[in-house]
Interface confidence: medium
Amino acid sequence: TALSPAPTTMDFTPAPLEDTSSRPQFCKWPCECPPSPPRCPLGVSLITDGCECCKMCAQQLGDNCTEAAICDPHRGLYCDYSGDRPRYAIGVCAQVVGVGCVLDGVRYNNGQSFQPNCKYNCTCIDGAVGCTPLCLRVRPPRLWCPHPRRVSIPGHCCEQWVCEDDAKRPRKTAPRDTGAFDAVGEVEAWHRNCIAYTSPWSPCSTSCGLGVSTRISNVNAQCWPEQESRLCNLRPCDVDIHTLIKAGKKCLAVYQPEASMNFTLAGCISTRSYQPKYCGVCMDNRCCIPYKSKTIDVSFQCPDGLGFSRQVLWINACFCNLSCRNPNDIFADLESYPDFSEIAN
C-alpha cells in the first residue's frame, strides 16, 4: 500500500517544443451545450469537457482525445499527444504509469513538473512530456494606446505589448489612483498590482491508488497563472475496505493501516516512513472524501542515486457526503459540498 507500485523506469525523448499556433480550436465560446447531459455507459464518468462548457462522457483507454474531449481522469487516463507532432492537437487516451522522460538530455521522473524554459511548464507523464504555455495572459496595451505592438523586452520572458510613447522614453511616475480599471502600461505596475490567486486543489484524479491533484496559482515573480500538482492516494486499491466496516455500521470514514511504510514512486523510495490515513467507504452509495487535509513534501531516493521531492496530499479526516447524484462520477458534485476549508499549504 505505497503511493504507487514501483514499475520499471523507461526513458522517452520527446520532440523539442514546437510552435502550437497552428493547432485547431476544439473549444467554441460562448458554450453551446445540448439541453440535457448524455447518458454514459456504466463505469464511464460523466464529466465537464475540457472547454469547461458541457457535460460529456469521458474518453476511455485508446479513444482519441483533444483539449475538449478529455480522458477519464478517474481511471487514471491522460491524453498522449506524442503521436501528433508537431501540432499536439489530437491524442490518444493512455494509462498513467511510472515511466520517466528525457528532454534536452535532462531526465525527469513520472509526474514531475518542470520548466524547460521560461515559456513553458511541462509535466512528465508515462514517458510523454506535456507542456502548457506560460505566456497566454499577456498584459494588453493600455486603452487608447497609440501604435501598440508586441515586443521582446530584455529581462522578461514573454513578449509584452508596448505603446510607441512608452517604448521611446521613460514614463514619469505619478501617484497611483484607482480608476474604473487601472490601465497603466508598465510591466512593473502589473506585477506590483498583481492580485494573488490560488485555486482550490482539484479532486484526486483516481478514486483509489496513486492519482494527481492540481491547482492554479499566480503567486510567483511574474504573476502568471501556473499549474501546481501534488500526488494523492485517497485509498489503496488492493484493500477491500468494505470488509473492515463494523457490523451495524454503514461507513468507515477513515482507514489507517497499522504499520508505517515508505512511499514509492517510479521505482524511487521515500527517505522516511509514514503512517498515512486513507478515506474509507460507505455501504449506501455515498462518497467518502477528504475534508481535512494538507500538502506535505515527500523526499524520494532513486536506485541510481538521484533524489527528488514531490508534494503529496496528506489526509487528516474524511467524511461521507449526503449523496452521489451521478454513480458514474464520484467527484461530480464536489463543488456543491459544504466548504470544509481544506488547509491549502
Epitope: R137, R139, P140, P141, R142, L143, W144, C145, P146, H147, P148, R150, W161, D165, R169, R171, K172, A174, P175, R176, D177, G179, A180, F181, D182, A183, V184
Partner: antibody, heavy 113, light 111 residues
Framework: QVQLVQSGREMKKPGASMKVSCKAS????????ISWVRQAPGQGLEWMGW????????HYAQKLQGRVTMTTDTSTSTAYLELRRLRSDDTAVYFC??????WGQGTLVTVSS | QSVLTQPPSVSGAPGQRVTISCTGT?????????VYWYQQLPGKPPKVLID???DRPSGVPDRVSGSKSDTSASLAITGLQAEDEADYYC???????????FGGGTKLTVL
C-alpha cells in the same frame, strides 16, 4: 472622485471651427492620456484620436488628419479638441475619455447653415 | 461601415442569456489586439463592461462575460434584466487604419 467635465453645447456654421474643452479633476492629470470620441445623432461611436497629457504627443484617426488638433493645458488639467472646416456630418456629441476608463458627459456640436 | 461588425439588434426575455458578436479581421482582433466592450444607456456616455484583459471592472456584475477567439469576440449577458436594455459596442485597435475602431453597435432589447 475622478471627473471629466466638458464645455457646453455649440452651434456652428459649415466651414467654421469648433473647440471643445474637457477639464479633469480627482487624479493626476499627466497620468492618463485623453481620447476624443464622437457620436452622430442615432449613430455609433467613432474614435477621433488621443493625446498624451504627459508630453502632448498625439495620435489622430486617419480620416480626420489635417482637420483635427488636440492639445492639453497641464496648469489647468484641461484637454482641448479643435476641429476645422466643419461640415454638416460633423454634427455629433463629442466625448472625452481618459486611459483609466472615465468619460466626460459629452458636448453636442451642431453644424448647420 | 465599421471594420468591426456587430449585429444591429438582439433581444431576449428577462432571465434569458444573450450574446453579442463582434467580428473583425486579421488587422485587429486576428492580430491579437485587445477588445473592450462598452454599454451605452440613452443620453449617457459609454461605460466599460469588459476591459482589454477580458476582465470586468469593479461594479460590473458577473452576469456579464466576454470571450475572444481568432478574429471574433463576443459579449454574453445572463439573467437578462430590464436595465440591460442599451446599446453595446466593441472596441479594438486596427493596425491597417493605425487607430482604435468601434463596432457599429448592437441595440439590446429586453422583451
Amino acid at each position: 472622485q475622478v471627473q471629466l467635465v466638458q464645455s457646453g453645447r455649440e452651434m456652428k456654421k459649415p466651414g467654421a471651427s469648433m473647440k471643445v474643452s474637457c477639464k479633469a479633476s480627482g487624479y493626476t492629470f499627466t497620468k492618463y492620456g485623453i481620447s476624443w470620441v464622437r457620436q452622430a445623432p442615432g449613430q455609433g461611436l467613432e474614435w477621433m484620436g488621443w493625446i498624451s497629457a504627459d508630453n502632448g504627443k498625439t495620435h489622430y484617426a486617419q480620416k480626420l488628419q489635417g482637420r483635427v488638433t488636440m492639445t492639453t493645458d497641464t496648469s489647468t488639467s484641461t484637454a482641448y479638441l479643435e476641429l476645422r472646416r466643419l461640415r454638416s456630418d460633423d454634427t455629433a456629441v463629442y466625448f472625452c475619455a481618459n486611459d483609466g476608463g472615465y468619460w466626460g458627459q459629452g458636448t453636442l456640436v451642431t453644424v448647420s447653415s | 461601415q465599421s471594420v468591426l461588425t456587430q449585429p444591429p439588434s438582439v433581444s431576449g426575455a428577462p432571465g434569458q442569456r444573450v450574446t453579442i458578436s463582434c467580428t473583425g479581421t486579421s488587422s485587429n482582433l486576428g492580430a491579437g489586439f485587445p477588445v473592450y466592450w462598452y454599454q451605452q444607456l440613452p443620453g449617457k456616455p459609454p461605460k466599460v463592461l469588459i476591459d482589454g484583459n477580458n476582465d470586468r471592472p469593479s461594479g460590473v456584475p458577473d452576469r456579464v462575460s466576454g470571450s475572444k477567439s481568432d478574429t471574433s469576440a463576443s459579449l454574453a449577458i445572463t439573467g437578462l434584466q430590464a436595465e440591460d436594455e442599451a446599446d453595446y459596442y466593441c472596441l479594438s485597435y486596427d493596425s491597417g487604419l493605425d487607430g482604435w475602431v468601434f463596432g457599429g453597435g448592437t441595440k439590446l432589447t429586453v422583451l
